[in-house]
C-alpha cells in the first residue's frame, strides 16, 4: 500500500487557447485531470488501472501552482494504490478549460481540451521527488512526482507491513526497511521474549518483563542461582532443590539436631567443663562451690553437709558455721569430748579408746556409719552416679542404673553408638541400652535407612519438553523445572505464540 | 513476645501427685539461653523458687522440695510441666510457670493457676 | 539459703511522695545478682530492676535501684496511683533462689 505523488508546479499557455487552436473565452480557466495507469509501452485510453484524480480550477492561461500540502489542500494530488507497487507506471496529464463551475467530463464540451501528454517508464519507492517538463507547440508543463509508501507499509515495493507495538504481542518500533526493531529490555523474532535481569540463571529463573528475574520451584536469589533447601532445614545446605545436607556437628532429616552443643552454644558458666552427651544435650561438671544445670548458681556451703556427728550447719555472709551437737567440737564437730565409758556407740557399734582415753573411735556393723554409728548407710547420699543414672541401695551395697548411652559402675562412660552417624539418609539415631535405633524419614526404612521404600515421584518421567523433574522428599511428589517457551504443572502446554502477521 | 499459660487441675488430694503444664506461644521453647521454670506462691505468703529445666532437659531443682518434683519439657508441643508427689495442704499454693533468660531473673510469667490439696 | 528480709511489712504513702524499699541479705550476694519485682492484686509479678540497678525497658523512670553486698534498696522518686503495690526482691546469685517476704505500698 503507498501513494503516488504529482506536485503540478507551472502551467504556460501565453495565447490562452484550447487545443483545437480556438481562444479560450474571456481566458483558459485551466483544471487538470490526471490517470495513472499500469505500464503501457504505448500509452492508450482505457481504465485509469491505477486510480484518477482531478483539481479544481488552478489558474487561468498562464499561472504557477502553489503547494498546498502543509494546508491540507490538493497539491501534490495523491493517487493511492493498495497494492505491492509494481515499479513501473503510465501517467496521463490532461488540462481542460471550464467555462461553467461544472467539472464533470460530460458537462464540457469536447474541445474543452486544452493539452494532454502522457509519460511511462520505472519509478522506485523513495522520497526523492522527479522533476518533469513537457511541451507542446502551445502549452508547457512542468511538475514532479514520486512514489512513497503508506503508514505501516515498507520495503522497495511497500509490500511490508508494520505497526509498532507495545504490548503482550511485541515490543518493537520498525526500521526503514519494515524489519523490527526491538525497544529496549526485549528481544526474539517478533520482541515478545523479555532480557531478564542480567545473570539471571538460564533454566532456573524467568522473567515476564526486562531486567526482572522469577525463580522457578525449588530455587531463590536475586539471580535464581541459590537452591531451595528442604522446609524446615536448620543447619543444612543444598546444592539441587529441596535437599538437606547437614553442616558439620548437625544430624536429622532436617538437620537440627544438634550434635557438637558444647562448642555451638558454650553453655556451661563460672568455668565447668561440657561435655556432649548425645543429640541436643550437654552436660556441665561444675568447678567447686557452684551448681545448676549451667554451673551458673553458686552452691550455698551448707549444702555439701560438712557438719559431722550430727552437727548443724547455718549459711554465713563469710561461709557457714557448725552447730555441734552435745560432746563435740571442732570447726566440723569432728572432735569427741566422751570416752568409752560412755558407751557413745550406737546400734551395736564397738568402742575403741584412743590416746590413752582422751579420745575414742566406733567400729560400726554393716549398714551403719558415722562417727558414733549413728546413720543408717544410705550408700545414695552422695549422688554417686553421674549423667542422670539412679542410684538403688542394695543392702551393704549400692548399684547405679544408667540411662541410655552411658555404662559403668558409676555410669560414668558414655557409650554412643551414634556419634559415627550410622543412620544413612538423614535418618535419627537414638542411643539404647543394647544399641542404638534409627529414626527413617519418610521414603526410607531398614535397620540403617538404607533402603529407599517410597517410589520415586520421578521414576515415571511425568515431565515432557525436556523438562528437569526434582523429587520432593517429604511428600513423596515431585516438581517440573519447565525449559523456556513451556508452562504447566508438567511443562506440557506450549506458551501461546503471537498471532501470525498478514502477509 | 512470649507468651506463658498454666493448665491442670485445680484441686488434688492429699498424698497424690499434682500435675501441672505450662505452654509456651509465639516464641520457641527451644532457646538456647532460656531457664523455663516453676515458682509457687502461698496464699498471702511470698514466693517459692521451685526448679527449671532447659529444653535440653537440664533440669535444677530447689534442695527442699527435690525429692518430690519431676519436671520435663516436650519441645513438639512447646511445653514444659510440673510432677509434685505426695502432696499436703502445705502445697495449696498459686502456681507459675516463668521463663528467665542468661541469669534467673524472671522476665515472662503465666497469669498463674490456684491449687488447693484438699480431700 | 540465702534469706532476704524486706522492710518494713507495709508502707504507707501518699501519691507523689518518695518511697524507699529495703532489702537485706543472710549473706553477701555476688555479683549484685538482686532483682526487684511489683505484683499487683491478682496479677503476676512484674521484674523492674535486675543486677540491683537496672532498670527494665518499659519500666519508668522514677523506678531505681541501689545497693551492693547485703543490702539493697528500691526506689520510687514519686508515686503515683498505679504504684500502689506488692514489691519484692529476689537473689540469683546462689541456690536455691530466694525471694524476700515482700513489702507492701499503701495509700496513705
Known amino acids: 500500500s503507498g501513494v503516488f505523488q504529482l506536485q503540478l508546479q507551472e502551467f504556460i499557455n501565453e495565447r490562452g487557447v484550447l487545443a483545437s487552436g480556438r481562444p479560450c473565452e474571456p481566458g483558459c480557466r485551466t483544471f487538470f485531470r490526471v490517470c495513472l495507469k499500469h505500464f503501457q509501452a504505448v500509452v492508450s485510453p482505457g481504465p485509469c488501472t491505477f486510480g484518477t484524480v482531478s483539481t479544481p480550477v488552478l489558474g487561468t492561461n498562464s499561472f504557477a501552482v502553489r503547494d498546498d500540502s502543509s494546508g491540507g489542500g490538493r497539491n501534490p494530488l495523491q493517487l493511492p494504490f493498495n497494492f505491492t507497487w509494481p515499479g513501473t507506471f503510465s501517467l496521463i496529464i490532461e488540462a481542460w478549460h471550464a467555462p461553467g463551475d461544472d467539472l464533470r467530463p460530460e458537462a464540457l464540451p469536447p474541445d474543452a481540451l486544452i493539452s494532454k501528454i502522457a509519460i511511462q517508464g520505472s519509478l522506485a519507492v523513495g522520497q526523492n521527488w522527479l522533476l518533469d517538463e513537457q511541451t507542446s507547440t502551445l502549452t508547457r508543463l512542468r511538475y514532479s512526482y514520486r512514489v512513497i509508501c503508506s503508514d505501516n507499509y515498507y520495503g522497495d515495493n511497500c509490500s511490508r507491513l508494520c505497526k509498532k507495538r507495545n504490548d503482550h504481542f511485541g515490543h518493537y518500533v520498525c526500521q526503514p526497511d519494515g524489519n523490527l526493531s526491538c525497544l529496549p529490555g526485549w528481544t526474539g523474532e517478533y520482541c515478545q521474549q523479555p532480557i531478564c535481569l542480567s545473570g539471571c540463571h538460564e533454566q532456573n529463573g524467568y522473567c515476564s518483563k526486562p531486567a526482572e528475574c522469577l525463580c522457578r520451584p525449588g530455587w531463590q536469589g536475586r539471580l535464581c542461582n541459590e537452591c531451595i533447601p528442604h522446609n524446615g532445614c536448620r543447619h543444612g545446605t543444598c546444592s539441587t532443590p529441596w535437599q538437606c545436607t547437614c553442616d558439620e556437628g548437625w544430624g536429622g532429616l532436617f538437620c537440627d539436631q544438634d550434635l557438637n552443643y558444647c562448642t555451638h552454644h558454650s553453655p556451661c558458666k563460672n568455668g565447668a567443663t561440657c561435655s556432649n552427651s548425645g543429640q541436643r544435650s550437654y552436660t556441665c561438671t561444675c568447678r567447686p562451690g557452684y551448681t545448676g544445670v549451667d554451673c551458673e548458681l553458686e552452691l550455698s556451703e551448707c549444702d555439701s553437709n560438712p557438719c559431722r556427728n550430727g552437727g548443724s550447719c547455718k549459711d554465713q555472709e563469710d561461709g557457714y558455721h557448725c552447730l555441734c551437737p552435745p560432746g563435740y567440737y571442732g570447726l566440723h564437730c569432728e572432735h569427741s569430748t566422751l570416752s568409752c565409758a560412755d558407751s557413745p556407740c550406737f546400734n551395736g557399734g564397738s568402742c575403741r579408746e584412743r590416746n590413752q582415753g582422751a579420745n575414742y573411735a566406733c567400729e560400726c556393723p554393716p549398714n551403719f556409719t558415722g562417727s558414733n554409728c549413728e546413720k543408717k548407710v544410705d550408700r545414695c547420699t552422695s549422688n554417686p552416679c553421674a549423667n542422670g543414672g539412679q542410684c538403688l541401695n542394695r543392702g551393704p551395697s549400692r548399684m547405679c542404673r544408667c540411662r541410655p548411652g552411658f555404662t559403668g559402675t558409676y555410669c560414668e562412660l558414655h557409650v554412643s553408638d551414634c556419634a559415627r552417624n550410622p543412620c544413612a539418609h538423614g535418618g535419627t539415631c537414638h542411643d539404647l541400652e543394647n544399641g542404638l535405633m534409627c529414626t527413617c524419614p519418610a521414603g526410607f526404612s531398614g535397620r540403617r535407612c538404607e533402603v529407599r521404600t517410597s517410589i520415586d515421584a520421578c521414576a515415571s518421567s511425568p515431565c515432557f519438553n525436556r523438562a528437569t523433574c526434582y523429587t520432593d522428599l517429604s511428600t513423596d511428589t515431585f516438581v517440573c523445572n519447565c525449559p523456556y517457551g513451556f508452562v504447566g504443572s508438567r511443562c506440557e502446554f506450549p506458551v501461546g505464540l503471537p498471532p501470525s502477521f498478514p502477509w | 513476645q512470649v507468651q506463658l499459660q498454666e493448665s491442670g487441675p485445680g484441686l488434688v488430694k492429699p498424698s497424690q501427685t499434682l500435675s501441672l503444664t505450662c505452654t509456651v506461644s509465639d516464641g520457641s521453647i527451644n532457646s538456647v539461653e532460656s531457664y523455663w521454670t516453676w515458682i509457687r506462691q502461698h496464699p498471702g505468703k511470698g514466693l517459692e523458687w521451685i526448679g527449671y529445666i532447659k529444653y535440653t532437659g537440664g533440669i535444677h531443682y530447689n534442695p527442699s522440695l527435690k525429692s518430690r518434683l519431676a519436671i520435663s519439657v516436650d519441645t513438639s508441643k512447646n511445653q514444659f510441666s510440673l510432677k509434685m508427689s505426695s502432696v499436703t495442704a502445705a502445697d495449696t499454693a498459686v502456681y507459675y510457670c516463668?521463663?528467665?533468660?542468661?541469669?534467673?531473673?524472671?522476665?515472662?510469667w503465666g497469669q498463674g493457676t490456684m491449687v488447693t490439696v484438699s480431700s | 539459703e540465702i534469706v532476704l528480709t524486706q522492710s518494713p511489712g507495709t508502707l504507707s504513702w501518699s501519691p507523689g511522695e518518695r518511697a524507699t524499699l529495703s532489702c537485706r541479705a543472710s549473706?553477701?550476694?555476688?555479683?549484685?545478682?538482686l532483682a526487684w519485682y511489683q505484683q499487683k492484686p491478682g496479677q503476676a509479678p512484674r521484674l523492674l530492676i535486675y543486677g540491683a540497678s537496672s532498670r527494665v525497658t518499659g519500666i519508668p523512670d522514677r523506678f531505681s535501684g541501689s545497693g551492693s553486698g547485703t543490702d539493697f534498696t528500691l526506689t520510687i522518686s514519686r508515686l503515683e496511683p498505679e504504684d500502689f503495690a506488692l514489691y519484692y526482691c529476689?537473689?540469683?546469685?546462689?541456690?536455691?533462689?530466694?525471694f524476700g517476704q515482700g513489702t507492701k505500698v499503701d495509700i496513705k
Open positions: 529476689q537473689q540469683y546469685s546462689r541456690s536455691p533462689i530466694t
Open positions: 516463668a521463663r528467665a533468660r542468661g541469669s534467673h531473673t524472671f522476665d515472662v
Open positions: 549473706q553477701s550476694i555476688s555479683s549484685n545478682y
